[in-house]
Amino acid sequence: MAVTACQGLGFVVSLIGIAGIIAATCMDQWSTQDLYNNPVTAVFNYQGLWRSCVRESSGFTECRGYFTLLGLPAMLQAVRALMIVGIVLGAIGLLVSIFALKCIRIGSMEDSAKANMTLTSGIMFIVSGLCAIAGVSVFANMLVTNFWMSTANMYTGMGGMVQTVQTRYTFGAALFVGWVAGGLTLIGGVMMCIACRGLAPEETNYKAVSYHASGHSVAYKPGGFKASTGFGSNTKNKKIYDGGARTEDEVQSYPSKHDYV
């Protein structure tokens, strides 16, 4: 019961996490503008992995997509790749984990197969979560680096043709969504891996067979002093586990002189 609960909870947590990773990837608020140095304070800039937007207090909003692929910063491309890999792995993990759920019966799937699938999905969730966390962290590092590099040059260059770096960006909501979602996916993956241990059978369960050499069951055969107490040669190579062995009542004994005493 605890295994099923752990597996089910791991699945739900991972599902929420992956939904969060997808949401974060699609969101435009990866970075938001700090407005302290603007003559028109009604302007708000925010940027995502796919487009840059401007919103004004008048209600005007405009977004422009990054249509070029080669011209974009390598960091942005890396973040995009990490997030997409995270989503793909997470989606595959979800698909695998659905079939691995103990509460869902599909044909005659054994627990060992379900355990393997649970472990596979768990690992996928862990990698997916790590990809998301890494992607968001790389982007956050890029923002911090840009912000501190720009602050020093903020007020220089009032002359003609002189440019001043005006990177006034701070962490957007998508970064926090991404971190939390990545963490949830990671936790869900760990839970799936823990559930896998409970699902996997430790050893093959042998049926208990009691053998004891009593006076009544010992047989003396000509040509050998061998007792047929079940320890004799297994001429038919019959499996003696999982129902193959005979119970105490079924052990065949040959008639001996003691039977007639």
């Epitope: 302007v43 840059s52 008048s58 405009e62 890029m142 440019q163 001043t164």
Partner: nanobody, 122 residues
């Protein structure tokens, strides 16, 4: 390389009109706030007017009602229509643009033009 090129300056009589233009060129991704600033001889540079992408405007008190700022987002061009010019409007007018580049849309830059001289004299 991004360039802001101002044009339309010149000599005009008091009460006259002028229209300044500023064209931004280069690998620009998006221009946010654009503005006009001026610097009279021996004085600090001051804000004349600014405009956002959505056409929200802000004017210096000294030019309100006389100057009109406008822009064409598709052409990355800024305009300043100056009416009822006075002698105190004599200055070098600079174009200013807050923009980011296509090569790095996560960094914002402020670019300044070379300036165009407006002289109001009889």
């Amino acid at each position: 390389q991004v360039q802001l090129v101002e044009s339309g300056g010149g000599l005009v009589q008091p009460g006259g009109s002028l229209r300044l233009s500023c064209a931004a060129s280069g690998s620009i991704f998006m221009i946010n706030v654009m503005g006009w600033y001026r610097q009279a001889p021996g004085k600090q540079r001051e804000l004349v007017a600014v405009i956002t992408r959505g056409a929200s405007t802000n004017y210096a008190d000294s030019v309100k009602g006389r100057f009109t700022i406008s822009r064409d987002n598709s052409k990355n061009t800024l305009y300043l229509q100056m009416n009822s010019l006075r002698a105190e409007d004599t200055a070098v007018y600079y174009c200013n643009a807050d923009l980011n580049l296509a090569s790095d849309p996560f960094k914002w830059y402020t670019y300044w033009g070379q300036g165009t001289l407006v002289t109001v004299s009889s």
